[in-house]
Amino acid sequence: SGVFQLQLQEFINERGVLASGRPCEPGCRTFFRVCLKHFQAVVSPGPCTFGTVSTPVLGTNSFAVRDDSSGGGRNPLQLPFNFTWPGTFSLIIEAWHAPGDDLRPEALPPDALISKIAIQGSLAVGQNWLLDEQTSTLTRLRYSYRVICSDNYYGDNCSRLCKKRNDHFGHYVCQPDGNLSCLPGWTGEYCQQPICLSGCHEQNGYCSKPAECLCRPGWQGRLCNECIPHNGCRHGTCSTPWQCTCDEGWGGLFCDQDLNYCTHHSPCKNGATCSNSGQRSYTCTCRPGYTGVDCELELSECDSNPCRNGGSCKDQEDGYHCLCPPGYYGLHCEHSTLSCADSPCFNGGSCRERNQGANYACECPPNFTGSNCEKKVDRCTSNPCANGGQCLNRGPSRMCRCRPGFTGTYCELHVSDCARNPCAHGGTCHDLENGLMCTCPAGFSGRRCEVRTSIDACASSPCFNRATCYTDLSTDTFVCNCPYGFVGSRCEFPVGLPPSFPW
C-alpha cells in the first residue's frame, strides 16, 4: 500500500490555444486530468489501472502551480494504491480548458483538450522527487513525481505491513525494510521476550520484564544459580534442589545430628583430651590433677588418700607429703615398724604375721579398709559411676544417680527409646539425646512413619527429552528442569511449534 504523488509546478501556454490550435476565449482556464496505469511499452488509452485524479482550474494560459498540500491536499496530487508497487508505471497527464464550472468529461466539448503527455518507465519507492519537463509545439509542463509507502507500510515495494507497538505482544519499532527493531531489553522474533538480568541462569531462572531474574521451583539467589536444600536441612548443602548433603561432622536426614561434638562444642576443660563416642556423646580424658565428666574439677592430690596406715596428707605446691603415725614410715607410710604383738589392727581387724614376724597384714572386717583397718570404706572413691553419673554413699552400700539418657547400676547403659520399636511400617529408629527419630521407608512419613504418602514422584521418570527430574519432598510432586529447546510441565514440547488453526 502506497501513494504515487505528482507535483505540478509550471504550465506554459503562451498563445492561450487549444491542441487544435484554436484560441481559448477569453483565455485557457486550465485544469488537469491524470491517469496512472501499469507499464506499457507504448502508452495507449484504456483503464487507469493504478488510479485517476483531476484538479480544479489551476490557472489561465501560463501559470505556476503553488504547493497546496497544506490547504486541501490538491498539489501534490495523490494517487493511492493498495497493492505491491511493481516498480514500473505509465502516466498520462492531460491539460484541459474549462469554459464553464462543470469539469466532468461529459460536460466538456471534445476539442477542449489543450495538451496531452504520456510517459512510462521505472520508479523505485523513495522520498526523492523526480523532476521532468514535457514540451509540445505550443505548451510546456514542468512537474515532479515520486512513490512513497502509506503509513505502516515498508520495503522496496511497500508490501510489508509493520506497526510499532509496545505491549505484551511486542516491544518494537519498524525499520525502513519493515523488519522489527526491538526496544532495549526485549528480544525474540516479535520482541515479546524480555532479556533477563545478565547472568540469570538459563534453565533455572526466567523473567517477565527486562533485567529481572525470577527463579523456578527449587532455585534461589540473585541469578537463580543456588539450589534450595531440603526444607529443615540444618548443617548441609545441595547441588540439586531439595538435597541435604551433610557438612563434615553432621548426620541424619536433616543433617541436624551432631557426629563431632568435640569439635563443635569443645566440652572438655583444663586441657583434657576429648573423644567422640557417638551422636552428641563424648568422653574426656583428664590431665593429672583434674576430674569430673568434663574435667572441670581441680583435684587435690590428697583427695586420693595416698597416705596409708593412718598417715595424714598435706598438700604442697609440688605434690603432697604424708605425716606417718608412730610405727610407720615411707613415702606413703607404707612401711611398718610394728608387729602383731603391738595389736596394730583396729576396728576388729585380725593380724597376720609376715616375713617371720618382721611385718604384718591386717584382715579388715566389712566396711573398713586401710593397712590397719583404720578407715571406713567410702565406696565412691573409685568413681564407679559412668557417663557423668553422681555417686552417693548409702551406709554399707552405694548408688549412682544417672544423668538423663543413662541407666544401669553404674549408669553404663544408654536409655533406648527405640526399645519398644516405635517406628511403624519398617521405619528405622535412631536414639537421640532427647528422644528418638524415625527414618521412614519410601511411601511413608510422619514422626512415627504412620502416614502413608505417595512414593518418589520422580520414580516413574515423568520428564521427557532428557530433562532433569526433582522431587519436592514437601509436596510429593515433581519438577522437570527442561533442556534448552523444550517446554512443558514434562518438557514434552519443542519450543516454537508452527501455529495451526481450527479451520
Partner: antibody, heavy 121, light 106 residues
C-alpha cells in the same frame, strides 16, 4: 488440534467469588508464542476482554475489572484459571477462555465453548 | 479508555457485498482482528493483522485498516454469513472489542 475447555460452577451468589478453570489439550500452555485470555459476554450483549496470562505468570487485566480479577496458571496441569471477587448480577455472562497468538498480532485463534455463570441468590 | 465503534446492524442481499466498519482513534496504527459469532456458538477468528485470513476462512472475507477506520468486507455474501461480527484491537496491554455488528442476509 488445540482444544480449550472451561469448567466451574454455573451459579454464584452475590458478593462471593467466581472461579473458573480452562484446561488446554493438544498443545502446551508453556509455549512462548501464546497468551491465554478470558473474555465474557453478558446475555444479548457484546464481548468484553477480562485479562490474559503468559506461561511464566505475567498477567494483564482490563482496568475496569482489575481490582476484582486474578488470573493464574498451572503449567504442570496445562491449565489457567480466573477468579472474580465480589460478584454482582452484572457479572452474569458466558465466560470464554481463548488462546491469543503473538504471531497473529494478538488474534485469538482458539476459543473454548464458553460456560454460562449466573450470579443470583 | 480506548473505544471501538461499530454500526449495530448491516443488511445485505445474497451475492452482494457487505461492509462493516470499525472506528477508533488512530486505529490504522493498530492491528485489527475480526471475529464472527453465530447464535449459541463461540467466536471464530476471520481476519487478523488487518487483512490476513486464517486457513479455512473463505476468500470472500477481506479486511483493510487505515486512518481511524478498519473495514471488514464480505463480497458475494451467503446466507451462512449471517452472524454478529466483532472487531478487536490492543490498546497498550488491554484487549478492546468493538460493540458488534449484526449482519442480516435478506
Amino acid at each position: 488440534e488445540v482444544q480449550l475447555q472451561e469448567s466451574g460452577p454455573g451459579l454464584v451468589k452475590p458478593s462471593e467469588t467466581l472461579s473458573l478453570t480452562c484446561t488446554v489439550s493438544g498443545g502446551s500452555i508453556s509455549s512462548s508464542s501464546y497468551y491465554w485470555g478470558w473474555i465474557r459476554q453478558p446475555p444479548g450483549k457484546g464481548l468484553e476482554w477480562i485479562g490474559d496470562i503468559y506461561y511464566t505468570g505475567s498477567t494483564y487485566y482490563n482496568p475496569s475489572l482489575k481490582s476484582r480479577v486474578t488470573i493464574s496458571v498451572d503449567t504442570s496441569k496445562n491449565q489457567f484459571s480466573l477468579k472474580l471477587s465480589s460478584v454482582t448480577a452484572a457479572d452474569t455472562a458466558v465466560y470464554y477462555c481463548a488462546r491469543e497468538d503473538v504471531i497473529l498480532r494478538g488474534g485469538s485463534d482458539y476459543w473454548g465453548q464458553g460456560t454460562l455463570v449466573t450470579v443470583s441468590s | 479508555s480506548y473505544e471501538l465503534t461499530q454500526p449495530p446492524s448491516v443488511s445485505v442481499s445474497p451475492g452482494q457485498t457487505a461492509s462493516i466498519t470499525c472506528s477508533g482513534q488512530r486505529l490504522g496504527d493498530k492491528y485489527v482482528s475480526w471475529y464472527q459469532q453465530k447464535p449459541g456458538q463461540s467466536p471464530v477468528l476471520v481476519i487478523y493483522e488487518d487483512s490476513k485470513r486464517p486457513s479455512g476462512i473463505p476468500e470472500r472475507f477481506s479486511g483493510s485498516n487505515s486512518g481511524d477506520t478498519a473495514t471488514l468486507t464480505i463480497s458475494g455474501t451467503q446466507p451462512m454469513d449471517e452472524a454478529d461480527y466483532y472487531c478487536q484491537a490492543w490498546d497498550r496491554d488491554v484487549g478492546v472489542f468493538g460493540s458488534g455488528t449484526k449482519v442480516t442476509v435478506l
